[in-house]
């Protein structure tokens, strides 16, 4: 969470954004907000990238001006124009490349004031992974799929009922490149599982950390996936 | 300026379906929400949904429980909004609205369902 | 579905008077709340969106105000031209529902 503050005359208005990540080849969203002004006239933002000539999107009198934008981000910005007279002056990124981490700033100038405020946005691959029990195998053993992960995460294992075992000597994982040749689809096999317990495959990288659990009994088998972006907020 | 412009009067048959147009020009298509709003003779108006053309998003009063498709073209600016399973009490005119930013209205578009 | 009230349903008025017309919500919409211009025969027209944020190109005479479940659309001093229907519009939860209006007529 980053706070800036702008100063205009005796006026300044706080600009709050949020260290944010994007998923290559998705939409994202580099949030921020501003302190509210009813007059949409008014309000002029602007989004800036370090080391970038040129602006990444500008927003004025109600309307994009994208006369100043650089070409990397042609076509592929918007804001919540709906939603800026309530403050909100997230910008919308279309199709997220590699090449759009960095420090992006928001720039924001009201009839109350004008400020601003830094924000990292990282970029990379992250999915759920979804577990299943693998009958081909020669032993009762487990399957653990996320089809796009980049930059190459760690895969680790754990169970319920043996907490603290290192999984590491009866899994074995393997990365394999996608077409479009950045991310990997990710498989790890668990070996010698028991009925009646919980496992867990966790899915981590310094973007985002995954994990799928399952429950396997007699009669069923149960599943629950999550994702989780670090260091957002 | 900002302007919305609709395709002309329909009439249709109880059972057909229509496809409403709506060409936006003036301001940057993807940045607004597009709503569709009817309004029956002599009747309130009726919010029926509402497309984001950012990324074709959408949400539905579900009054309408499936019968009504919106969807953008992007590169054309064009939002259209589809009503299937017609009967006579979707006689109405038609429009397509912004909620913020803009006071301009589509023009309207009357849809007649008649046997 | 979150009701909306309107009142009054008509009014009466001179060219220069002060109009109000209220708007209640069923349900706390936070600033979720729209007002509209219809003419006989004519498209709406977006007055008013997130209850005080005026619409580009409409006057300065035309204001609102309220929000969590009571607001108030005001024309400041009624001109000829304003004399129309006016709704109400919650855009907080769908689906979004309008008022049934209040006719502006000219006294």
């Known amino acids: 969470l980053i706070i800036g503050f702008g100063i205009s005359g005796k006026h300044f208005i706080t600009v709050t954004t949020f260290t944010s990540a994007g998923n290559i080849g998705e939409d994202g969203t580099l949030s921020c907000t501003f302190e509210p002004d009813i007059k949409l006239n008014g309000i002029v933002i602007q989004w800036l990238k370090e080391g970038i000539k040129g602006l990444v999107h500008e927003f004025k009198e109600g309307k994009d001006d994208l006369s100043q934008q650089h070409e990397m981000f042609r076509g592929r910005t918007a804001v919540f124009a709906d939603q800026v007279v309530v403050g909100n002056a997230s910008l919308r990124l279309k199709n997220v490349q590699l090449t759009d981490a960095g420090t992006y700033t928001c720039y924001i100038r009201t009839s109350k004031g004008k400020g601003n405020a830094n924000l990292e946005y990282k970029t990379g691959a992250f999915s759920m992974p979804e577990i299943n029990v693998d009958y081909n195998a020669s032993s009762e053993s487990l399957r653990c799929e996320a089809p796009r992960w980049f930059p190459q995460p760690t895969v680790a294992w754990a169970s319920q009922v043996d907490q603290g075992a290192n999984f590491s000597e009866v899994s074995n994982t393997s990365f394999e490149l996608n077409s479009e040749n950045v991310t990997m689809k990710v498989v790890s096999v668990l070996y010698n599982v028991t009925i009646n317990n919980t496992y867990s495959c966790m899915i981590e990288n310094d973007i985002a950390k995954a994990t799928g659990d399952i429950k396997v009994t007699d009669s069923e088998v149960k599943r629950r996936s999550q994702l989780q972006l670090l260091n957002s907020g | 300026q900002v302007q919305l412009v609709q395709s002309g009067a329909e009439v249709k048959k109880p059972g057909a379906s229509v496809k409403v147009s709506c060409k936006a020009s003036?301001?940057?298509?993807?940045?607004?929400?597009m709503h569709w709003v009817r309004q029956a003779p002599g009747q309130r108006l009726e919010w029926m949904g509402y497309v984001d053309p950012f990324n074709g998003g959408t949400s539905y009063n579900q009054k309408f429980k499936g019968r009504v498709t919106i969807t953008v073209d992007t590169s054309s600016s064009t939002a259209y909004m589809e009503l299937s399973s017609l009967r006579s009490e979707d006689t109405a005119v038609y429009y397509c609205?912004?909620?913020?930013?803009?006071?301009?209205w589509g023009q309207g578009t009357l849809v007649t369902v008649s046997s | 579905d979150i009701q909306m009230t309107q009142s009054p349903s008509s009014l009466s008025a001179s060219v220069g008077d002060r109009v109000t017309i209220t708007c209640k919500a069923s349900q706390d919409i936070k600033s979720y709340l729209s007002w509209y211009q219809q003419k006989p025969g004519k498209a709406p027209k977006t007055l008013i969106y997130?209850?005080?944020s005026l619409a580009d190109g409409v006057p300065s005479r035309f204001s609102g105000s309220g929000s969590g479940t009571d607001f108030t659309l005001t024309i400041s001093s009624l001109q000829p031209e304003d004399f129309a229907t006016y709704y109400c519009l919650q855009h907080g939860e769908s689906p979004y529902t309008f008022g049934g209006g209040t006719k502006v007529e000219i006294k």
């Open positions: 997130y209850a005080t």
């Open positions: 003036g301001y940057t298509f993807t940045s607004y929400y």
């Open positions: 609205a912004f909620i913020a930013g803009f006071a301009n």
